[in-house]
């Protein structure tokens, strides 16, 4: 059958997925393209706000916030007294932590 994944090569740990009369590659984190041969840049969309730096770690993007900001995407200002504008820390996150 032309639609199955037999002989289909998905590079860099990608998985072949069938459906809709075709097959495609579901790529591992950090890769993209038809055969998962292209490196995907998770930082391309500039996800870290307020001058924060985005790093393309193998586990996904990581933001390192500029001084004065915090949060997963550096979206929350830190008040001068050290408190943040975050109403409450999201589950599993301490205030001041970078989010993964």
């Amino acid at each position: 059958d032309l639609d199955d994944c037999a002989g289909r090569a998905c590079a860099n740990g990608g998985t072949c997925v069938e459906g809709g009369g075709a097959h495609r590659c579901s790529c591992a984190l950090g890769f993209g393209g038809r055969d998962c041969r292209e490196r995907a840049d998770p930082c391309a969309a500039r996800p870290c706000a307020h001058g924060g730096r985005c790093y393309a770690h193998f586990s996904g993007l990581v933001c390192a916030c500029a001084p004065g900001y915090m949060g997963a995407r550096c979206e929350f200002p830190v008040h001068p007294d050290g408190a943040s504008a975050l109403p409450a820390a999201p589950p599993g996150l301490r205030p001041g932590d970078p989010q993964r």
Epitope: R39, A56, A64
Partner: antibody, heavy 118, light 109 residues
Framework: QEQLVESGGGLVQPEGSLTLTCTAS?????????MCWVRQAPGKGPEWIAC???????TDYASWAKGRFTVSKASSTTVTLQMTSLAVADTATYFC???????????WGPGTLVTVSS | QVLTQTPSPVSAAVGGTVTISCQST????????LSWYQQKPGQPPKVLIY???NLEIGVPSRFKGSGSGTQFTLTISGAQCDDAATYYC??????????FGGGTEVVVK
């Protein structure tokens, strides 16, 4: 396979200048990294010098390195470190290293030796 | 930012436990952006632990990192002869600043 290789080291006289080059293979600086320079004097620990963030070209320096050291991106696969007014105390192996998240250097070059002597 | 490590050298028997401490003069970024490296003569440092406690891919599980804020520990459980090396901690700080500890030499007998 991702690799870094430093070049440009050698013998230089005190007050002299030198430019080191770090060449990347297996990846390019189109993704966002801190490409950094770290040095290690004989028998001593590593010492951070400077980084250039490939996302926007911004640079950061150790306080002692400002003014004498300049890091820049020469191409999509090369970073340079310009060193001026070199002193005997600058004798060290100079490493190129990449931070790709969480502030650690997961990829290093083998290093290039810079000897400052008259 | 200054990172102070356990004085060198630290000695351990094969199969024994080695504990190395690292103290920072100020909190590292996110309270856990602290890494540990192993270095052998003639080689660049090799990362063992990142983010205080995450084991780098390919590193044996006998290496364990712990701590947060300003105080961190690297533990080697069941030390092997191959673990004889110098170990460094390295922190990342707000403002995109890096710093290394002075190193701890580990001798395995």
């Amino acid at each position: 396979q991702e690799q870094l290789v430093e070049s440009g080291g050698g013998l230089v006289q005190p007050e002299g200048s030198l430019t080191l080059t770090c060449t990347a293979s297996g990846f390019s600086f189109s993704s966002s990294y801190d490409m950094c320079w770290v040095r290690q004097a004989p028998g001593k620990g590593p010492e951070w010098i400077a980084c250039i963030y490939t996302g926007d070209g911004s640079t950061d320096y150790a306080s002692w390195a400002k003014g004498r050291f300049t890091v820049s991106k020469a191409s999509s696969t090369t970073v340079t470190l310009q060193m001026t007014s070199l002193a005997v105390a600058d004798t060290a192996t100079y490493f190129c290293a990449r931070n790709s998240g969480y502030g650690y250097f997961g990829l290093w070059g083998p290093g290039t030796l810079v000897t400052v002597s008259s | 930012q200054v990172l102070t490590q356990t004085p060198s050298p630290v000695s351990a028997a094969v199969g024994g436990t080695v504990t190395i401490s690292c103290q920072s003069t100020e909190s590292v970024y996110g309270s856990d952006w602290l890494s540990w490296y192993q270095q052998k003569p003639g080689q660049p440092p090799k990362v063992l632990i990142y983010q205080a406690s995450n084991l780098e891919i390919g590193v044996p599980s006998r290496f364990k990192g712990s701590g947060s804020g300003t105080q961190f520990t690297l533990t080697i459980s069941g030390a092997q002869c191959d673990d004889a090396a110098t170990y460094y901690c390295q922190g990342y700080y707000s403002g995109y600043i890096y710093a290394f500890g002075g190193g701890t030499e580990v001798v395995v007998k």
